[in-house]
């Protein structure tokens, strides 16, 4: 049960982030403009990963997309591309863990091959939360270099006659989302990594023998010791071929006529 | 159509209090209430976000003048407290439209403050 | 504050002639995030409310007639009549449409010669 419950919330807090970094990577608050001395202003900018927006007082906002792709900065378009492989190897994972989920029968898939597809998904999942949380930590250090750059230019004008104000940046929503989103993503594939361990077979250097205390019939499973007991029942009536891989969370009963091999 | 009409104005006494009133019709997502002193130029009083009645104000009325507006009547208000000779205006109700220019004005209402 | 000054204060023109009025702000208008210069331009007749004509320091307000036109970029702006039309005897003003609190010029008055 346990181990059930583990690959089942990995998947549920994995699904949860993935849906987050996917967000974040649309989201266009990636930097607002630094409001340090006026809470309320009536022009607003902030900029996302696609395009860049302003919102003004009168309630009007106006979004235009970044259309270039060789004039953008590289560490924007680094940005861009660990977001991007986070959200397509989460997507893959996702996919992958649906399958490996062991409350989803499908065909008579061996626990071992479930256990590897839970390692394998887990592994993209944390793979996809790094690619995440590098690729906003990487856009909030642009921005924090940034913001000290324009702060020291700040009012720098013409012999002082006219001040510009230059427009800082700060730390807009999708970073905190990216942030979040890329921890429960590589939370999720931790714990999938970890029901995997409660769903693999231990490998053994002999062949188990099981003895049914019920009676007469002997299977004989090759597999690990674990599931050798014999005392599982198989209520679905259908053969024991699965090598003899069982785990403590399937329903454990008293041996019944339609215990056979 | 966006139609704006004040009322409020009129004689007040220095120290006094007056509250003006802009009744709003059609869309308005933000409105302002501008005034004009006798012979004078334009001067930005308030500025309130109609949805979520946040409201900015110029330093000269921070304290002194309240902006709100009420949903439920459409109206939009300017509660003037401490009232002095030089706040004698017209003042206007106008929305602010895309790049933040005034593109509704009301007919205005004169407000004179004199003992 | 950003101040907003405004000249000439007043001028004298016939009708047919090319006006320009220019105004000065003490800081600069143009937002980086999307190259606008928030600066309006209004007109304004005796005992009238102000009437909104050039938005974005160049954008020409819907049925302003295409005389009116505007110029400009970080402090210094210009509004041109190309053709002065008696209906355009008038007082105009400048505003700073891109930080609170918004500003307006003084006002240039255009009066018949």
């Known amino acids: 049960m346990a181990v059930t419950a583990c690959q089942g919330l990995g998947f549920v807090v994995s699904l949860i982030g993935i849906a987050g970094i996917i967000a974040a990577t649309c989201m266009d608050q990636w930097s607002t403009q630094d409001l340090y001395n006026n809470p309320v202003t009536a022009v607003f900018n902030y900029q996302g990963l696609w395009r860049s927006c302003v919102r003004e007082s009168s309630g009007f906002t106006e979004c235009r997309g970044y259309f270039t792709l060789l004039g953008l900065p590289a560490m924007l378009q680094a940005v861009r591309a660990l977001m991007i492989v986070g959200i397509v190897l989460g997507a893959i994972g996702l996919l992958v863990s649906i399958f490996a989920l062991k409350c989803i029968r499908i065909g008579s898939m061996e626990d071992s091959a479930k256990a590897n597809m839970t390692l394998t998904s887990g592994i993209m999942f944390i793979v996809s939360g790094l690619c995440a949380i590098a690729g906003v930590s990487v856009f909030a250090n642009m921005l924090v270099t940034n913001f000290w750059m324009s702060t020291a230019n700040m009012y720098t004008g013409m012999g002082g006659m006219v001040q510009t104000v230059q427009t800082r940046y700060t730390f807009g929503a999708a970073l905190f989302v990216g942030w979040v989103a890329g921890g429960l993503t590589l939370i999720g594939g931790v714990m999938m990594c970890i029901a995997c361990r409660g769903l693999a077979p231990e490998e053994t250097n002999y062949k188990a023998v099981s003895y049914h205390a019920s009676g007469h019939s002997v299977a004989y499973k090759p597999g690990g010791f674990k599931a050798s007991t014999g005392f599982g029942s198989n209520t679905k009536n259908k053969k024991i071929y699965d090598g003899g891989a069982r785990t403590e969370d399937e329903v454990q009963s008293y041996p019944s006529k339609h215990d056979y091999v | 159509e966006v139609q704006l009409v004040e009322s409020g104005g009129g004689l007040v006494q220095p120290g006094g209090s007056l509250r003006l009133s802009c009744a709003v019709s059609g869309y308005t997502f933000s409105m302002n209430w501008v005034r004009q002193a006798p012979g004078k130029g334009l001067e930005w009083v308030a500025w309130?976000?109609?949805?979520?009645?946040?409201?900015t104000y110029a330093d000269d009325f921070k304290g002194r003048f309240t902006i709100s507006r009420d949903d439920s009547k459409n109206t939009l208000y300017l509660q003037m407290n401490s009232l002095r000779a030089e706040d004698t205006a017209v003042y206007y109700c106008?929305?602010?439209?895309?790049?933040?220019?005034?593109?509704?004005w009301g007919q205005g209402t004169l407000v004179t403050v004199s003992s | 504050d950003i101040q907003m000054t405004q000249s000439p204060s007043s001028l004298s023109a016939s009708v047919g002639d090319r006006v320009t009025i220019t105004c000065k702000s003490s800081q600069s208008l143009l937002n980086s995030g999307n190259q606008k210069s928030y600066l309006t331009w209004y007109q304004q007749k005796p005992g009238k409310a102000p009437k909104l004509l050039i938005y974005w320091a160049s954008t020409l307000e819907s049925g302003v007639p295409s005389r009116f036109s505007g110029s400009g970029s970080g402090t210094d702006y210009t509004l041109t009549i190309s053709s002065l039309q008696p209906e355009d005897f008038a007082t105009y003003y400048c505003?700073?449409?891109?930080?609170?609190?918004?500003?307006f010029g003084q006002g240039t008055k255009v009066e018949i010669k």
């Open positions: 505003q700073n449409a891109y930080s609170f609190p918004f500003t």
């Open positions: 309130i976000n109609m949805y979520t009645g946040e409201p």
């Open positions: 106008a929305r602010l439209v895309r790049g933040n220019g005034f593109d509704y």
